[in-house]
């Protein structure tokens, strides 16, 4: 039975040219996290594997930095980075947990963070 929940940074906004940290947090389960995948729509950004470390997709190598922790930092943001991002936690024995973050990249100098929310 999957008892865990994923809390994410929710709906967030950031300035064009800036950077943002995407983070998810898995709680309420004793399952071992074996791998975390970070995806943008259907594109794989990065994998963080418990045994093999980080793998950043070649097409994102220049603009993605791993961390802090299991999080992912997006750098040199463009308006094209606006959209949905997913953290996919592979765990044992529970299975897979998925969290969603919506990022809006703004042209203006005002970028406010949205509220946090939970995905069971």
């Amino acid at each position: 039975m999957m008892t865990g929940t994923i809390e994410t940074t929710g709906n967030i906004s950031a300035e064009k040219g800036g950077s943002i940290i995407l983070q998810c947090h898995l709680s309420s389960t004793t399952a071992q996290v074996t791998q975390v995948n970070w995806e943008q729509q259907d594109q794989l950004l990065a994998i963080c594997n418990a045994d093999l470390g980080w793998h950043i997709s070649p097409s994102f190598k220049d603009r993605v930095a791993p961390g802090p922790g299991l999080g992912l930092t997006l750098q040199s943001l463009t308006v094209n980075d606006t959209g949905e991002y997913f953290c996919i936690y592979h765990t044992y024995p529970d299975g897979t947990y998925t969290g969603r973050i919506f990022l809006e990249v703004l042209e203006s100098s005002v970028a406010e963070h949205g509220a946090r929310f939970q995905i069971p």
Epitope: H25, L26, V33, W54, H55, K61, A65, P66, G67, G69
Partner: antibody
Framework: EVQLQQSGTVLARPGASVKMSCKTS????????MHWVKQRPGQGLEWIGG????????TYNQKFKGKAKLTAVTSASTAYMELSSLTNEDSAVYYC??????????WGQGTSVTVSS | DIVLTQSPATLSVTPGDSVSLSCRAS??????LHWYQQKSHESPRLLIK???QSISGIPSRFSGSGSGTDFTLNINSVETEDFGMYFC?????????FGGGTKLEIK
Amino acid sequence: EVQLQQSGTVLARPGASVKMSCKTSGYSFTSYWMHWVKQRPGQGLEWIGGIYPGNSDTTYNQKFKGKAKLTAVTSASTAYMELSSLTNEDSAVYYCTREGGYGMDYWGQGTSVTVSS
Amino acid sequence: DIVLTQSPATLSVTPGDSVSLSCRASQSIYNNLHWYQQKSHESPRLLIKFSSQSISGIPSRFSGSGSGTDFTLNINSVETEDFGMYFCQQSNSWPYTFGGGTKLEIK
């Protein structure tokens, strides 16, 4: 087998600079952060900063900006830390430790630095 | 920066006792808290990751719990080889920080 082998004991004069190394083996060097941690005699652990050799991204503890410079040579699977403008406060053991998102799971044996005139 | 406060600073116990070490964060770090053991003249060793997840090769008498700001490392029936320093560390945000440590000593 994962190994982090650090360079030997250093004795330096105040005002000097030192560069220490952390040679790794047994894993993909470019897939893990390499962090550096300071420990003064009888004291706790202090995070200096880290470098991700996969893209040379660095992050520092604000306290050590201008004091420590982190670099990595991927072809040699070796990370380096240079400490500049040494003072007595820099006398400590310095550890390198790798992190792949799941805690700092392997540590070097430490490099002891003594600053004395 | 996130401040981690460990208590007690020193814990004097007899082998066979069970003990709890505390680590408190200045703000929520979810479960991004790791525990390390350091014996005299040795490098630190990862004991527990993400507050409660076990590490291969670490005896099962070590366990962790907590989330948010309050975390606990439990040692069930302390053995002589367990004496030394224990540190917590957060990986929730840069800069990473360590707690000041708890010294586990023989009574």
